[in-house]
């Protein structure tokens, strides 16, 4: 089963819960045998996916694998939706499966009225 | 190599509840989801559910909403299934099985032994 | 949720002979990354089951190149070019598409 192919990791319907205004790092498990690929993130936007230029990215190397890491500091609630990584290597275009990160904003759901307030209007 | 342990056999009073195991060794289940299957004797299989271990996100069959509850240890390598209510419908052999996603030769996947339960007054 | 149906029921061989099982999900099982997430299983008298197949066609470590796995949509069929003593027990395809995860019924194939 060993391979000098890169692996991506990401699993296949993953999902993170995560809340507005926390952060939080989004990790793409890299697999790769001698050079490390370039690797980057995009967020799907209906069929296709938009690359993520301007964000904070940085490598996390353990010892049987490497992760390629989104930072979202803090997390804003339209970062809300699904999200892939890719990789170059050897002119291959490596695609993940997508994950999907589901942001609960805070601040609008403490605004909102509890049923009790909602039923005395 | 990969295996899964599970106890062999559980022998459980109707209307308590039960807590099987399943014991990963040669992989980290952090990489991989680690899902349930109900085998009822001399029947085919139910897919139960399935967990995310590295954080702790489950999806459940619709039918075993409320009755299963799946659960990980990531640092003992563990993952449980908790039965509730206990019938003799659930008198069944329940299956772990593990399934390791990566990008292109993708999802290998390795099932433990089953543990036979009996429920029974 | 998506119903599996599988046939024949029980499939009576002769050790060298061909055998074919077929599997028809009740929607299409391709999914929106383009993929088909139909595996087949073997259950062996006793043993826990065994992927042999998966993504419709992709033989696991292992299988021997007498298994084929085709279909597209919602029509899948498992293809035995030479049966052998060890193929005898319960065969389930098995669909990861859809929420959630379903099976078939399964096909007993016994030797004759």
């Known amino acids: 089963k060993e391979s000098c192919d890169v692996q991506l990791y990401i699993k296949r319907q993953s999902e993170h819960s995560i809340l507005a205004g926390d952060p939080f790092e989004l990790e793409c498990p890299v697999k790769y045998c001698a050079n490390r690929p370039h690797v980057t993130w995009c967020k799907l936007n209906g069929t296709t996916c938009v690359k993520l230029e301007d964000r904070q990215t940085s490598w996390k190397e353990e010892k049987n694998i490497s992760f390629f890491i989104l930072h979202f500091e803090p997390v804003l609630p339209n970062d809300n939706g699904s999200y892939r990584c890719s990789a170059n290597f050897q002119s291959n275009l490596i695609e993940s499966h997508s994950t999907t990160l589901y942001v609960t904003d805070v601040k609008s759901a403490s605004e909102r009225p509890s049923k009790d307030e909602m039923a005395s209007r | 190599e990969v295996q899964l342990q599970q106890s062999v056999a559980e022998l459980v009073r109707p209307g308590a509840s039960v807590k099987l195991s399943c014991t990963a060794s040669?992989?980290?289940?952090?990489?991989?989801?680690m899902y349930w299957v109900k085998q009822r004797p001399e029947q085919g299989l139910e897919w139960i559910g399935r967990?995310?271990?590295?954080?702790?996100?489950?999806k459940y069959a619709p039918k075993f909403q409320g009755k299963a509850t799946i659960t990980a240890d990531t640092s003992s390598n563990t993952a449980y299934l908790q039965l509730s209510s206990l019938t003799s419908e659930d008198t069944a052999i329940y299956y772990c099985a593990l399934l390791y996603y990566g990008s292109s030769y993708d999802y290998f996947d390795y099932w433990g032994q089953g543990t036979t339960l009996t429920v029974s007054s | 949720d998506v119903v599996m149906t599988q046939t024949p029921l029980t499939l009576s061989v002769t050790i060298g002979q061909p055998a074919s099982i077929s599997c028809k999900s009740s929607?299409?099982?391709?999914?929106?990354?383009?993929?088909?997430?139909l595996n087949w299983l073997l259950q062996r008298p006793g043993q826990s089951p065994k992927r042999l197949i998966y993504l419709v066609s992709k033989l696991d470590s292992g299988v021997p190149d007498r298994f084929t796995g085709s279909g597209s949509g919602t029509d899948f069929t498992l293809k035995i070019s030479r049966v052998e003593a060890e193929d005898l027990g319960v065969y389930y395809c098995w669909q990861g598409t859809h929420f959630p995860q379903t099976f078939g019924g399964g096909t007993k194939l016994e030797i004759k």
């Open positions: 040669g992989f980290n289940i952090k990489n991989t989801y």
């Open positions: 967990i995310d271990p590295a954080n702790g996100n489950t």
């Open positions: 929607q299409s099982l391709l999914d929106s990354d383009g993929k088909t997430y």
